[in-house]
Amino acid sequence: LNTTVLQGMAGQSLRVSCTYDALKHWGRRKAWCRQLGEEGPCQRVVSTHGVWLLAFLKKRNGSTVIADDTLAGTVTITLKNLQAGDAGLYQCQSLRGREAEVLQKVLVEVLEDPLDDQDAGDLWVPEESSSFEGAQVEHSTSRNQETSFPPTS
C-alpha cells in the first residue's frame, strides 16, 4: 500500500485527501487513525458522521477535522494548528462493521517555523527538503517526487 508523505509548518493547517472507490465503499463510514508502532494498533483520532448520508458534515476531535464526499470518493482530514507532536504515521480507513480497510497510509512531518527559536525537541526537520510539499510515495519512490500535496491554511 502506498505511503503518502505530507509536510506542514508548525502552527499552520495540513489538509490530507484520501481517495477511494465510491461504489466499493458505498455506505461505509471513514476514519482517521494514528499507527502507534510496527504491529501495534491504529488509534482512532476521528471518524465521519454516524449517519452515512450526513458524512459530508465536518466532524471534529480536538484540532482534527474529517469530512467525506461520498459521491466523489474523497475523505478529507484537516490537522489544524499543527504541532510537533502531530508528526507520525496515520491511516485513512473505511469502516465495515468492526473491520477497517486501510485506504491510505500517511506520514505527517512537521516543519519547525524558522522564526520560532524554541527548542524543537522531538521535531524532525528533513534536511533534504526545504519546501512544504508532500509526495505520493509508492514503496518504490522517495520523498519529493511525483505529485505535490501542498498544505493549506
Epitope: E38, E39, A87, L89, G121, D122, W124, V137, H139
Partner: antibody
C-alpha cells in the same frame, strides 16, 4: 539535538560483569522504546535487547544469545537506559550501540549512539 | 525471522545503477536500511521500506513488501561505497541481514 551517548565499556574477564549506560537528550525519552544492538569486530549487526515505554509496562525482550545473562533497564527521570552484562563470554566482545526505535510518535525513526566497546578477554 | 541479503559483496562504477536485495523468511510490515562505513556507527538510511532518512541523497530508493525488499542507487557515487544492512522491527527477535558490502570500481 536528538542524541544518545553510550558509556561504561571496557576490558573485562570471562564470567565477569559490566554495566553499560546510555544518556538520551533532545527528545521525549519516556515515550520511546529503547534497544541495544551490538557488532563484533569485523562482523554484522545483532539486536540483543529492548525495553518499551511506561505505557507499554516497560516490557523487555532479549535475543536468545544473551537471555538470562543480560538485563536492560531504564530511568525515565534521568533519561538513562542501561544494559547489565553478566556471565560474560569472549563472544560478547563487540561495540555496543544504544538505539531508539518504537513506541513514541516517531517510532519509525531510529536514533543511534556512537557506541561503547566491550572486550571480554583473560 | 531470517533476513538474507544479496549479494554479500558487489562493486559498481561511478554512474552505474545498483540494486541490492533483502529477503525475509517470513512476511514483515516494513524494512529498514542502514549504511555503515569503516570505524563509524551505522546510519539510518531508509525507514518504513521507502522513506529516505534525513540527509540521504535522492539517488537512493527503497521498495518491496512482504518477504522481498530492495535498496537501489540510481547512479553510483564514490561516497556510496559502504556496507548496507537491512533490518526488520516487526517481530522479536528484531533481526538484521548479514550486510551487502558495496565497493567502487
Amino acid at each position: 539535538e536528538v542524541q544518545l551517548v553510550e558509556s561504561g565499556g571496557g576490558l573485562v574477564q570471562p564470567k565477569g560483569s559490566l554495566k553499560l549506560s546510555c544518556a538520551a537528550s533532545g527528545f521525549s525519552f519516556n515515550t520511546y522504546a529503547m534497544n541495544w544492538v551490538r557488532q563484533a569486530p569485523g562482523k554484522g549487526l545483532e539486536w540483543i535487547a529492548r525495553i518499551r515505554s511506561k505505557s507499554n509496562n516497560y516490557a523487555t525482550y532479549y535475543a536468545d544469545s544473551v537471555k538470562d545473562r543480560f538485563t536492560c533497564s531504564r530511568d525515565d527521570s534521568e533519561n538513562m537506559f542501561y544494559l547489565q552484562l553478566s556471565s560474560l563470554k569472549t563472544e560478547d566482545t563487540a561495540m555496543y550501540y544504544c538505539v531508539r526505535h518504537g513506541d513514541g510518535n516517531l517510532w519509525y525513526i531510529d536514533v543511534w549512539g556512537t557506541g561503547t566497546t566491550v572486550t571480554v578477554s583473560s | 525471522n531470517v533476513l538474507t541479503q544479496s549479494p554479500a559483496l558487489m562493486s559498481a562504477s561511478p554512474g552505474e545503477k545498483v540494486t541490492m536485495t533483502c529477503s525475509a523468511s517470513s512476511s514483515v510490515s516494513y524494512m529498514y536500511w542502514y549504511q555503515q562505513k569503516p570505524r563509524s556507527s551505522p546510519k539510518p538510511w531508509i525507514y518504513l521500506t521507502s522513506i529516505l532518512a534525513s540527509g540521504v541523497p535522492a539517488r537512493f530508493s527503497g521498495s518491496g513488501s512482504g518477504t522481498s525488499y530492495s535498496l537501489t542507487i540510481s547512479s553510483m557515487e564514490a561516497e556510496d561505497a559502504a556496507t548496507y544492512y537491512c533490518q526488520q522491527w516487526s517481530f522479536n527477535p528484531y533481526t538484521f541481514g548479514g550486510g551487502t558490502k558495496l565497493v567502487i570500481k
